[in-house]
């Protein structure tokens, strides 16, 4: 091992304070005791150390805790967290939501880094499920967090956690993810009355089956076109013209602008043209009068 440089006389740090920002890297290495640093980590964030100085402080902690930092240190890492690698973080056992919040705060405003992703993974695995408080915290910092999870990971989200989800948290979710989230949302909001229920369930409807859409059409919900366009095509196809008209209410006029896009295009192809004509929107492409319409499932049975 290389012999370490001795600390110059009078420079031995008695505590972590602003005077250390004027220490050269080798002076920090020589004059700051690792145990002192560990007990006063809460001060590091209030001191504008350079990135090079933070490297030295990290090295001291790594030497003190080769098996991974204790949570008392992790909670106060502050900007030093940005120096950690995913490998470092995998050694940690983070159990406190306060610790998680403190570290997410450091990365606030930036994309989710590999370090943050590893930290979240360690935290959620440690808890066993995505409870409401955790989900609340994660979506507050990363609105797209929920949609970054696989359907398998989403299956561990308890229905009670769905209350923490905001519409923007689901913006980037694909149908497979909404298929998992929708039944949980339905369960979470089941005791709400009609209009309140629709407001809450609306963002999740991309995972709704046909029978639930039919039920909603009986409740004067006036679904907007943006929501309708996110519905599963296979769920929309069996809806009748009358049901779609009731589902959309005054927004039904928006179908004309979307007639070339799925699911509207595919739905139009399944409707009788004379039924479409009753809407008075000039929708074209329906089944001409007199043609036999076979249900898809029936066609499969026949073939």
């Amino acid at each position: 091992e290389v012999e370490k440089t001795a600390c110059p006389s009078g420079k031995k740090a008695r505590e972590i304070d602003e005077s250390l920002i004027f220490y050269k890297k080798w002076e920090l290495e020589a004059c700051v005791d690792a145990a002192l640093l560990a007990t006063q980590m809460d001060r590091v964030n209030a001191i504008p150390f350079t990135y090079e100085q933070l490297d030295v402080l990290k090295h001291k902690l790594d030497e003190l805790y080769p098996q991974g930092y204790p949570e008392s240190v992790i909670q106060h890492l502050g900007y030093l967290f940005l120096k950690m690698s995913p490998e470092d973080i995998r050694k940690w056992n983070v159990t406190s939501l306060e610790t998680l919040k403190a570290l997410l705060e450091v990365n606030k405003g930036h994309e989710m880094s590999p370090q943050v992703a590893t930290l979240i993974d360690r935290f959620v695995k440690g808890r066993g499920q995505l409870d409401k408080d955790t989900l609340d915290t994660l979506t507050a910092f990363y609105p797209g967090y929920l949609c970054s999870l696989s359907p398998e990971e989403l299956s561990s989200v308890p229905p009670s956690s769905i209350w923490a989800v905001r519409p923007q948290d689901l913006d980037t979710c694909d149908p497979r993810q909404l298929d998992v989230l929708y039944p949980k949302a339905r369960l979470a909001f089941q005791n709400m009355n009609g209009s309140e229920y629709f407001v809450k369930i609306q963002s999740f409807l991309g995972g709704a089956p046909t029978e639930d859409l039919k039920a909603l059409s009986q409740q004067n919900v006036s679904m907007d076109l943006a929501t309708f366009m996110k519905l599963r095509t296979d769920a929309v196809l069996p809806l009748t013209v009358a049901e779609v008209q009731k589902l959309l209410g005054p927004h039904v006029e928006g179908l004309k602008a979307e007639e070339r896009h799925r699911p509207v295009r595919d739905w139009i192809l399944r409707q009788r043209q004379d039924d479409l004509d009753t809407l008075g929107l000039g929708l074209q492409g329906g089944i001409p009068n007199g043609y036999l319409v076979l249900d898809l499932s029936m066609q499969e049975a026949l073939s």
């Epitope: 304070d17 602003e18 920002i21 004027f22 809460d42 504008p48």
Partner: antibody
Framework: EVQLLESGGGLVQPGGSPRLSCAVS????????MSWVRQAPGKCLEWVSA????????YYADSVKGRSTISRDNSRNTLYLQMNSLRAEDTAVYYC??????????WGQGTLVTVSS | QSALTQPPSVSGSPGQSITISCTGT?????????VSWYQQHPGKAPKLMIY???KRPSGVSNRFSGSKSGNTASLTISGLQAEDEADYYC??????????FGCGTKLTVL
Amino acid sequence: EVQLLESGGGLVQPGGSPRLSCAVSGFTFSSYTMSWVRQAPGKCLEWVSAISGSGGNTYYADSVKGRSTISRDNSRNTLYLQMNSLRAEDTAVYYCAKVGRAALDYWGQGTLVTVSS
Amino acid sequence: QSALTQPPSVSGSPGQSITISCTGTSSDVGSYNLVSWYQQHPGKAPKLMIYEVSKRPSGVSNRFSGSKSGNTASLTISGLQAEDEADYYCSSYTSSSTVVFGCGTKLTVL
């Protein structure tokens, strides 16, 4: 909410020794360096002294070195400045301030010390 | 440690931009990115507006910005408003772990 409240000012005879206090709330007092800054009537701000989180390190401006002692009681969340041998030029509003990222991020409303016979 | 040098006064009309300079030495402003700016309204405590040369504390309008070149730091206020009228002080941390202030600049909004 961070709050700093100074007290102990008033009229002091030349050569007097007032002790200023600053009661603090709203943050973890023991984790932060604290500072005293003064402002003579119509004059510049002048940094006076600072003390590190647990009181191990203290720093003074040349103008008060040897005549003032900064201290803190972390159990009471209170900062002190003991001033001795006061002169007319020490007349000023004295502010206590919290040091964050090497800047004074929160200040009290100040306490006026007037040195006059 | 001598005070940092600031112009005694600057003025500007509402909506305009103004810049206040703060000149130090190589042992304070020039050596470290530890320059702060404070706003002080008459009879009030100073308020931190900029720290570490160009960073804004939360709650401070983005009309306030800071920069540094060599031994001189600058505070720029854009879209001047009546409530910006105040005294502005710069300060720098020094290598002797002390703080040095400027003598302040009185900003008048015409």
